[in-house]
Structure formats: C-alpha cells, structure tokens
C-alpha cells in the first residue's frame, strides 16, 4: 500500500492525531490535503518544522498561503523562523524575525499564546 492509499484509510481518524504521528506521516509521502490539515489539533501541529509540514502536505503545501490567517496554520507560522518559511516560496508572513531567539518558556507561552522572543 502506497502513502496515498494509506492516507485515505486513516484520514477520518487524523483529527486527534498527536505530533509524533504527524511526524511519522510526514515520512510516508501521504500528501495530506489542506482540508484535513486544518482539522488537526493545533497543539499537535505547532511542534512540526517547516520541512516536516512540507513533506506532510507534499504538493498541497502551496495551500498554506490561502489559509495563513486561519488556525492552525496561523499559529504554526508564528512559531517558525521567517527564514525557514521563506524557503517555501509562498510569501508566508508572520514568522520569527531573523536573529531572534525563541525561549521555550511553557508558562509564558500558556499565558500569552505566543512564544517568548529575545531580540538580537
């Protein structure tokens, strides 16, 4: 069974998938469509890297642009370095500016909903 066939079988169960499962899926050429991606748990999507999301979506990655202001895409963009987002060539905006450090302060992030940044 190839990646696409596998994805069709599990598609309806993906809404509650944890980050680990999404990372694993990204290695299987599933080409997840944006409608499915938008239904994923925000907390499961946030830890994914730009490279992992690109692999997870395959050719559908260009659809991120149309949904860049909808969750979970919006929240995911806010967690990525702008340099990394730029590699997609989609014109995505709102990433962490170059030269900033991301501090993983769980309490700070839980309160504010955004990562804590330290300027250069």
């Amino acid at each position: 069974m190839n990646g696409s066939e596998y994805f069709v079988k599990i598609q309806s169960f993906l809404g509650g998938a944890p980050t680990e499962d999404l990372k694993a899926l990204s290695q299987q050429n599933v080409s997840m469509d944006l409608a499915t991606f938008m239904k994923l748990r925000t907390d499961a999507v946030l830890p994914l890297t730009v490279a992992e999301v690109q692999k997870l979506l395959g050719p559908h990655v260009e659809g991120l642009k149309a949904e860049e202001r909808h969750r979970p895409v919006r929240d995911w963009i806010l967690r990525q370095r702008q340099d990394d987002l730029d590699t997609l060539g989609l014109g995505l905006q709102g990433g962490i500016p170059n030269g900033y450090l991301v501090l993983d302060l769980s309490m700070q992030e839980a309160l504010s909903g955004t990562p804590c940044l330290l300027g250069p």
Partner: antibody, heavy 119, light 108 residues
Amino acid sequence: EVQLVQSGAEVKKPGASVKVSCKASGYTFTDYNMDWVRQAPGQGLEWMGDINPSTGGTIYNQKFSGRVTMTEDKSASTVYMELSSLRSEDTAVYYCARRRIGTGYFDVWGQGTTVTVSS
Amino acid sequence: EIVLTQSPATLSLSPGERATLSCSASSSVISSYLSWYQQKPGQSPRLLIYRTSNLASGIPARFSGSGSGTDYTLTISSLEPEDFAVYYCHQWSSFPYTFGGGTKVEIK
C-alpha cells in the same frame, strides 16, 4: 449539482442589522471555505471575509471588523453573514462564494442577496 | 492593501476582434495568487482563470491569462457575443484580498 442558495432581499433602516444566509448543496460542505463578497450599485467587488465551516474559524477584512460576523450550521450546510450598524453605503448585493480550502479563488457563487439601507 | 488597477475602464470592440485587458498591482503579486472573473448584468461573477493562466472548468480556450509581478493580462482571442461583460482581476497574495475596479467589454 453544486449550488449556493442565498436568502431573499432585505430592506433595513440605518443602525439596524441584517443576517444573510447561504445554503450549500451538492458537495462536501467542510472541504470548502465560504467567503462573502459585496457589490455596491454600479461598483466593483469587495471581499468581506470568510469562514471555515469545519472549524468555525473566521477571517474578516479589517474594514468590516467589529460589524461583521460569519457563522455556520454544519447540520444544515448553511453559513450566515451578519452585518450590524448598517449605513446607507452598505446598500449592495451580498454574495457568498465557495473557496476550496487551500486555494484563494471562488469557483461557485450564490445568486446574491440585495440589501437596501434606507431611512 | 494591494490596489488592483484595471485598464481600460471600457473596451469597445466588435465580435471576432481580440480583447486585451490589463490589471496592474500596486505591489508585486505572486502569480499563483491572481485570478479573473466575468460578470454579466444581473448575474453573479463567474470564475474564468485562476493562478494567472489556468482556465476554470467549462471556460472556452479563447480566454487566456498571463503576467507576473505587478502586471497581468487577460486576453480574449476572438470575441463572441456572449463575451460582452465586465471582467475583474482578483489577488489573494496579500491581505486583505482585493479586486480590480473592472473592465467593461462592450459592443462597438
């Protein structure tokens, strides 16, 4: 057949609110966002915002922020657009338009709802 | 916001002639994020072209689109009677999404 059927024409007084419905049929409702676009008499098209029927997430054009609210009823495959604090310049035809999630173009449009704001 | 300026505002042509409609953006637009719509009097808009040059379903091949950056063009190779209408360009490269003011193609 894919169809978007909108509610009928409305006449409202300045300061009032209007709620327009858009019932979708012929496709998987949650695979498409629904956008709202308006057209004042003899004028061009103006994008108002959109709603993702799957999540209920909304994005509004800042021009309408605070006055527009978009909602959905998945069980009825229907989206709603409510515009408050109406003024005469809100007189327009309001269209719902289907947009496949992950794209930015509108491939199916409703027939339009005429909203007239007059004292 | 990106302002889309369409020219000319009105194009007077005869059936069989070639129509060239322009759409100029105030800032660069990624070509995948530009589309064209046709609207006839009393009707809803209809998608003609998406991603600058892709024909929407059911649209005849006499319609074509091209362009990049800030300049985009819709061409109708040979006007048919049903092509006389208003045409709008639309961008979703930058928020908020915007439409051009329209070009009316009328019978000369």
